[in-house]
Interface confidence: low
Amino acid sequence: PASLAGCYSAPRRAPLWTCLLLCAALRTLLASPSNEVNLLDSRTVMGDLGWIAFPKNGWEEIGEVDENYAPIHTYQVCKVMEQNQNNWLLTSWISNEGASRIFIELKFTLRDCNSLPGGLGTCKETFNMYYFESDDQNGRNIKENQYIKIDTIAADESFTELDLGDRVMKLNTEVRDVGPLSKKGFYLAFQDVGACIALVSVRVYYKKCPSVVRHLAVFPDTITGADSSQLLEVSGSCVNHSVTDEPPKMHCSAEGEWLVPIGKCMCKAGYEEKNGTCQVCRPGFFKASPHIQSCGKCPPHSYTHEEASTSCVCEKDYFRRESDPPTMACTRPPSAPRNAISNVNETSVFLEWIPPADTGGRKDVSYYIACKKCNSHAGVCEECGGHVRYLPRQSGLKNTSVMMVDLLAHTNYTFEIEAVNGVSDLSPGARQYVSVNVTTNQAAPSPVTNVKKGKIAKNSISLSWQEPDRPNGIILEYEIKYFEKDQETSYTIIKSKETTITAEGLKPASVYVFQIRARTAAGYGVFSRRFEFETTPVFAASSDQSQIP
């Protein structure tokens, strides 16, 4: 086969139909889409294209200029009357810039063979396109059979002489793709076998997924894969002031479209998304977490003077627990409970109240009962101690009532009902409580425990004792029961308002059993244990006043 190297066809004046064709064609040439990167666009080359034709009388370049006097590179061939045409047009070396799949867009016109007189046997309406890969920019001295055919190109629209007269140019656009490419560049070749063609423009490009910011992640320009069905996974990087739980990824399709986003970036705490960037929260606003969409106004009773705040500072006298979410208003301790009332039943007290007028802005209000036992004479109060029972409990009360049992009878108590909430322990302020003063009812007194013998004679015994430990009211009187030992059914009762008595009319040298009990308005207490004392014989002197064991 003949070599295609070293051949060059000098430009000649083009026939009228080509010029008409160009004028129409130029108006249709549009800018390339953003996902296409041109490797060659014959329309934009200002100087010599450097293409070669073989044989020299085959393809010829038509030198035209556009309205800005920029050259227009058009190649034509129209050897329709001659047989066995084999006209080649070779491009210069085209770098593939790392792309493994490229696209060739041809814009051309083709004469309808039926409109050409006498050439029906030799006229063709197709041409062929080939390519040859090479790392060598000066490697055009190759044989025809080394080129790989891309496709036979046919026109969708051919034109006739009539069209020329009407100046209606039928420009064809055909796109073919080639891949996978493995070398740094390639040559294209166009083979005419006897058609009437004007090759108006050749654009060689690859497709990329253009750099994009999606979900606050930047994805770089990405050249599409070699396979038309291939999806390339591309990692994105988060924009300034953003973070991610799951690294952002997208897939670049063979058509240069971004598909199937995975993961996303979020503006970090203190920043919010605006126009695809992360902007600081302005003073008075905050964002506590990347998972929150936008900055929020500081909640009630809090503020921030800073940009990029992740939380707001509570105003004076307002607080926030560590467990309170930052979106929650700052709160304060509650005011005191109100309208406390008491109901006394012997040694039990039932307290009831209504909630504080100001809960401090919280729902976790509970109540604590402080119990103080007060001495009305000394004006002193002391803690009640552990014997008092609280129903249901003393602290953490949710209901507005409580029952205290096992109180001392006939005793002055002060109960402080304190309202507390989740921030009470954070506040240095005074406790908020309402006081209720109550006096428990009188009850039967406890037993007399401490009895001393006084003067003992042959016919009488004098005794003294202390008031019961728990008088449970005002002692009205004491009842003293005594009998001669082993004569229990024959007893005597003496009543006394004092804590001393003398039992008279007793037998000398006899043992007597004494029991004492006290009475209040609530009734008698139980008798004391038995105390035994012996009258003296007729001859003995009085005994001392020693303590009974």
Partner: antibody, heavy 116, light 108 residues
Framework: QVQLVESGGGLVQPGGSLRLSCAAS????????MSWVRQAPGKGLEWVSA????????YYADSVKGRFTISRDNSKNTLYLQMNSLRAEDTAVYYC?????????WGQGTLVTVSS | SYELIQPPSVSVAPGQTARITCGGS??????VHWYQQKPGQAPVLVVY???DRPSGIPERFSGSNSGNTATLTISRVEAGDEADYYC??????????VFGGRTKVTVL
């Protein structure tokens, strides 16, 4: 009753380090923020550092930031002040204080002298 | 950073009233605490949160706070009130406790 007892003071050369401790008792230590306050001889009170009850937040005066570290061990009811790169102007009595009611309990202080 | 200004000294006759001022920008928006310190002793809180008294502090000690000035008032001054006094606030913009300079109260 509430008691705060500082220890760890003494004489140290410029550039040296000391660690002060403050043992607390008589109150729920982990519920309250704590501070270190110092007083140079014949001078007024100067706040040094503070720490929240949980230990999660710490605060420092500009004069000690980067040199002193406040910490606490709530299991031991103890507050610490690690002092590095000491200077002559750090000479003072160092007090620890609670903030139960804005600093209403103070220790008796421990003297730190920085001198060559 | 936030600054508190106190007079260096205040003199008062026994039984009279002593007033110690503490000046600071918009101090009324802050909680002011007052400390008393006697020679060789640790400071003692005498007023907190502008005007509250801890238990055990006599009613003669009172506080107020308005505008740009907080005031500690000691009425019916006694010889035992002779001491250094300090005001203190928490400055939330710098996250610092701030003490005023000391005021020496002398009972004549």
């Amino acid at each position: 009753q509430v008691q705060l007892v500082e220890s760890g003071g003494g004489l140290v050369q410029p550039g040296g380090s000391l660690r002060l401790s403050c043992a607390a008792s008589g109150f729920t230590f982990s519920s309250y923020a704590m501070s270190w306050v110092r007083q140079a001889p014949g001078k007024g009170l100067e706040w040094v550092s503070a720490i929240s009850g949980s230990g999660g937040s710490t605060y420092y005066a500009d004069s000690v930031k980067g040199r002193f570290t406040i910490s606490r061990d709530n299991s031991k009811n103890t507050l610490y002040l690690q002092m590095n790169s000491l200077r002559a102007e750090d000479t003072a009595v160092y007090y620890c204080a609670t903030h139960a009611a804005a600093g209403d309990y103070w220790g008796q202080g421990t003297l730190v002298t920085v001198s060559s | 950073s936030y600054e508190l200004i106190q007079p260096p000294s205040v003199s008062v006759a026994p039984g009279q009233t002593a007033r110690i001022t503490c000046g600071g920008s918009n101090i009324r928006s802050k909680s002011v605490h007052w400390y008393q310190q006697k020679p060789g002793q640790a400071p003692v809180l005498v007023v907190y949160d502008d005007s509250d008294r801890p238990s055990g502090i006599p009613e003669r000690f009172s506080g107020s706070n308005s505008g740009n000035t907080a005031t500690l008032t000691i009425s019916r001054v006694e010889a035992g009130d002779e001491a250094d006094y300090y005001c203190q606030v928490w400055d939330s913009s710098s996250d610092h406790w701030v003490f005023g300079g000391r005021t020496k109260v002398t009972v004549l």
